[in-house]
């Protein structure tokens, strides 16, 4: 007897982080033998949607014409072939931005920082929130979470970076969120450009915009050092 059917691939276009009101298409790619594709959403009792395969039958399209809170969440897909159902795909986490007002992102003491020194990025929200996320543009692993302990609500989160190197230079934004849904984020803060200049020992000029290369430092997760801030938030990075 043949083994289990290979699991399909699940992805979203233009991406998995979508602003409120924008359209998104979820794709599930299986095999040419697929007869039906099914999309399941975590905590949804019935199959969330089901579609015929598109020719040549190896994938299906699930359209969301206008992103709302209801669509945010964790999805998996399956396909059915003449011999039965496939294994589930790896999960897709569809995140909606625009659920809350935008926070303010600032750098202390300044967004102009000398290599080797320290800087703290401060994300502040008007209303109390329990999760703050810092995102660096063009980083392969851009999310850094600070989540409050015991559900305590906070107006701000500090992201200390020490010692700063040229890798830390670039454009940052932050988001705020409530813990009851990791899939609903605020509008993004206005961008903050962190400019790292060379130290006395290292006088090389530092570019004011980070440039991502195929295997350059921008592809590494942002891992700032320093003590956990005193705001009652715990650091989580992905």
């Amino acid at each position: 007897q043949a083994g289990p059917l290979p699991k399909p691939t699940l992805w979203a276009e233009p991406g998995s982080v979508i602003s409120w009101g924008n359209s998104v298409t979820i794709w599930c790619q299986g095999t040419l033998e697929a007869r039906e594709y099914r999309l399941d959403k975590e905590e949804s009792p019935a199959p969330w949607d089901r579609q015929n395969p598109l020719e040549p039958k190896n994938k299906a399209r699930f359209s969301i014409p206008s992103m709302t809170e209801d669509y945010a969440g964790r999805y998996r897909c399956y396909y059915r072939s003449p011999v039965g159902w496939s294994q589930p795909s790896d999960p897709l986490e569809l995140v909606m931005t625009g659920a809350y007002s935008k926070p303010t992102l600032s750098a202390l003491p300044s967004p102009l920082v000398t290599s080797g020194k320290s800087v703290t990025l401060l994300c502040q929200s008007r209303s109390p929130m329990d999760t703050f996320l810092l995102i660096k543009e063009r980083a392969a692993h851009p999310l850094l979470h600070l989540r409050s302990e015991h559900g305590a609500q906070q107006h701000q989160a500090e992201f200390p970076m020490s010692p700063v190197t040229s890798v830390h230079g670039g454009t940052y934004r932050c988001f705020s969120s409530h813990g009851f849904s990791h899939y609903l984020l605020s509008h993004p803060s206005d961008p903050l450009e962190l400019i790292v200049s060379g130290s006395l020992e290292d006088p090389r000029p530092s570019p004011t915009r980070s440039v991502s290369t195929a295997a350059g430092p921008e592809d590494q997760p942002l891992m700032p050092t320093g003590s956990v801030p005193h705001s009652g938030l715990r650091r989580h990075w992905e």
């Epitope: 007869r35 039906e36 959403k41 949804s44 009792p45 019935a46 199959p47 969330w48 209801d70 003449p82």
Partner: antibody, heavy 120, light 107 residues
């Protein structure tokens, strides 16, 4: 006991619209898709489309895309089909049926059907 | 769309007979074939799903078989209450489609 309750009959004028209801009981309404099926007098069964009551996702038979609109009201566990621009061709019995969703993709419980007569 | 054909539109049989109703699909439907009974008053019930599985509460005199494009419903010992029209339906792809029905009458 699973029950799908539909009104017995509707008399409507040509060009008008009608909204048919199907009230579900005896199971968790949001856990099963709902189908709508048309049967003209003395004819076979035609699938109009299906709706997921938990999120409102729909799939339609292309033939009925401009004729029928499927909706649900979760608070009353009721599914609806609205038929617009009615003509004599729309005179038929309309059934709602619950989706079994497992092997077969069958419709395991059916309403009694609503007879729609289009006449001036 | 997949076309479902029930070539016999009506069938006469005697009580106690073994009756077979056939259904053909325009393409392989991978056993996603269901059978329904419609009584003269319009009531519709599911009898068999996935070719051969008996729906709950359906008498065991009903059975189904087939594969690929050809399927059949058998009533092993015809009873008066079985007088009805029988429809096949494919659940393999959207849109769902039905056969034209076979009306079963008593001789």
């Amino acid at each position: 006991e699973v029950q799908l309750q539909q009104p017995g009959a509707e008399l409507v004028k040509p060009g008008a619209s009608v909204k048919l209801s199907c009230k579900a009981s005896g199971y968790t309404f949001t856990s099963y898709w709902m189908h709508w099926v048309k049967q003209r007098p003395g004819q076979g069964l035609e699938w109009i489309g299906e709706i997921n009551p938990s999120n409102g996702r729909t799939n339609y038979n292309e033939k009925f895309k401009s004729k029928a609109t499927l909706t649900v009201d979760k608070s009353s566990s009721t599914a609806y089909v609205q038929l617009n621009s009615l003509t004599s061709e729309d005179s038929a019995v309309y059934y709602c049926a619950r989706d079994r969703y497992d092997e077969g993709n069958a419709m395991d419980y059916w309403g009694q059907g609503t007879s729609v007569t289009v006449s001036s | 769309d997949i076309v479902m054909t029930q070539t016999t539109s009506s069938l006469s049989a005697s009580l106690g007979d073994r009756v077979t109703i056939s259904c053909r699909a325009s393409q392989d439907i991978t056993n996603y074939l269901n059978w329904y009974q419609q009584k003269p008053d319009g009531t519709v019930k599911l009898l068999i799903y996935y070719t051969s599985r008996l729906h709950s509460g359906v008498p065991s005199r009903f059975s189904g078989s087939g594969s690929g494009t050809d399927y059949s419903l058998t009533i092993s010992n015809l009873e008066q209450e079985d007088i009805a029209t029988y429809f096949c339906q494919q659940g393999d792809t959207l849109p769902r489609t039905f056969g034209g029905g076979t009306k079963l009458e008593i001789k």
